[in-house]
């Protein structure tokens, strides 16, 4: 048997994927365990393996079917299990109704690329991926800057509060390298979280013209 | 709806090996856990091996363990049955099964299928 405190974490990318992490204090780091999805309006369930991402945490993908499919609406619930093997039988060591919609992580920002770029300013645009169409523009986003000699930790974060791809950075000094990244977030959902942020974008800025009255 | 194409089965003299062949198409691969299963003549479909999603779980009929290997390669839609030290009461028609419940893959109902592959082993 396996004690200790367990945590069964899960989040809806908006279409066809539910990542899930369980954690377990004392767990078996050879234990094969799977997450079992049972959705209360489909005729499909899912499964998916659980991988080893740390010394007593496991990671899996349920893929519901092609990546842009829409594959569960605002009114559906799924149980979501983590069955593990002991012997020849499986014991169910985790369980959740999941309402996918109050779980929301949508997928990190694609397609990051500058639009315009100046001395002291530069206009980027970037995508969304896999999100779903019932959001419409009820999504957010946040952005930040990486200057030189800085953190990512210690860039501040800028906030769009609308769904607006597109961003002007201000105020960037001349001849400068910097690094970009954006992430999504819908307005819907009790628990929904952030976004990763997207890949770093780099950029340089235009150097200042010589000999030019300012 | 789920595609799968079996190949790789022939004749073999016994103690030979063969390797078989599933390649699917017609949705993501990576949702499904994958079997292999067989049938003789006049006899029921019978399990013979299975492989998770993730390609890290292993489990065989207790007649095959330590003779047959089943792996896939998600990059190539394909599962594989390396079969070694083949017996003559291993021919049969051999199938390949796919089903995103790993929970139900075995009770054959709700699987996809393919066509099936002859392996007839001659002693």
């Known amino acids: 048997a396996v004690n200790g405190t367990s945590q069964f974490t899960c989040f809806y990318n908006s279409r066809a994927n539910i990542s899930c992490v369980w954690s377990q204090d004392g767990a078996l780091q050879d234990t094969s365990c799977q997450v079992h999805a049972w959705p209360d309006r489909r005729r499909w369930n899912q499964t998916c393996e659980l991988l080893p991402v740390s010394q007593a945490s496991w990671a899996c993908n349920l893929i519901l079917g092609a990546p842009d499919s829409q594959k569960l609406t605002t009114v559906d619930i799924v149980t979501l299990r983590v069955l593990c093997r002991e012997g020849v039988r499986w014991r169910v060591m985790a369980i959740q109704d999941f309402k996918p919609f109050e779980n929301l992580r949508l997928m990190a920002p694609i397609s990051l690329q500058v639009v315009h770029v100046e001395t002291h300013r530069c206009n980027i645009s970037w995508e969304i991926s896999q999100a779903s169409h019932y959001f419409e523009r009820h999504l957010e986003f946040e952005a930040r800057t990486l200057s030189p000699g800085h953190t990512w930790e210690e860039a501040p974060l800028l906030t769009l509060k609308q769904k607006q791809e597109w961003i002007c950075l201000e105020t960037l000094t001349p001849d400068t390298q910097y690094e970009f990244q954006v992430r999504v977030k819908p307005l819907q959902g009790e628990f929904t979280t952030w976004s990763p942020w997207s890949q770093p974008l780099a950029f340089r800025t235009k150097p200042a013209a010589l000999g030019k009255d300012t | 709806e789920v595609q799968l194409v079996e190949s790789g089965g022939g004749l073999v003299q016994a103690g030979g090996s063969l390797r078989l062949s599933c390649v699917v198409s017609?949705?993501?691969?990576?949702?499904?856990?994958m079997a292999w299963f067989r049938q003789a003549p006049g006899k029921e479909r019978e399990f013979v091996a299975v492989?998770?999603?993730?390609?890290?779980?292993?489990e065989y009929v207790d007649s095959v363990k330590g003779r047959f290997t089943v792996s896939r390669d998600n990059a190539k839609n394909t599962v594989y049955l390396q079969m070694n030290n083949l017996k003559p009461e291993d021919t049969a028609v051999y199938y390949c099964?796919?089903?995103?419940?790993?929970?139900?893959?075995?009770?054959?109902?709700?699987?996809?299928w393919g066509q099936g592959t002859q392996v007839t082993v001659s002693s």
């Open positions: 099964a796919a089903n995103t419940d790993y929970f139900q893959i075995r009770s054959v109902d709700n699987n996809a």
């Open positions: 017609g949705d993501v691969f990576v949702r499904y856990t």
């Open positions: 492989v998770t999603d993730s390609g890290r779980t292993t």
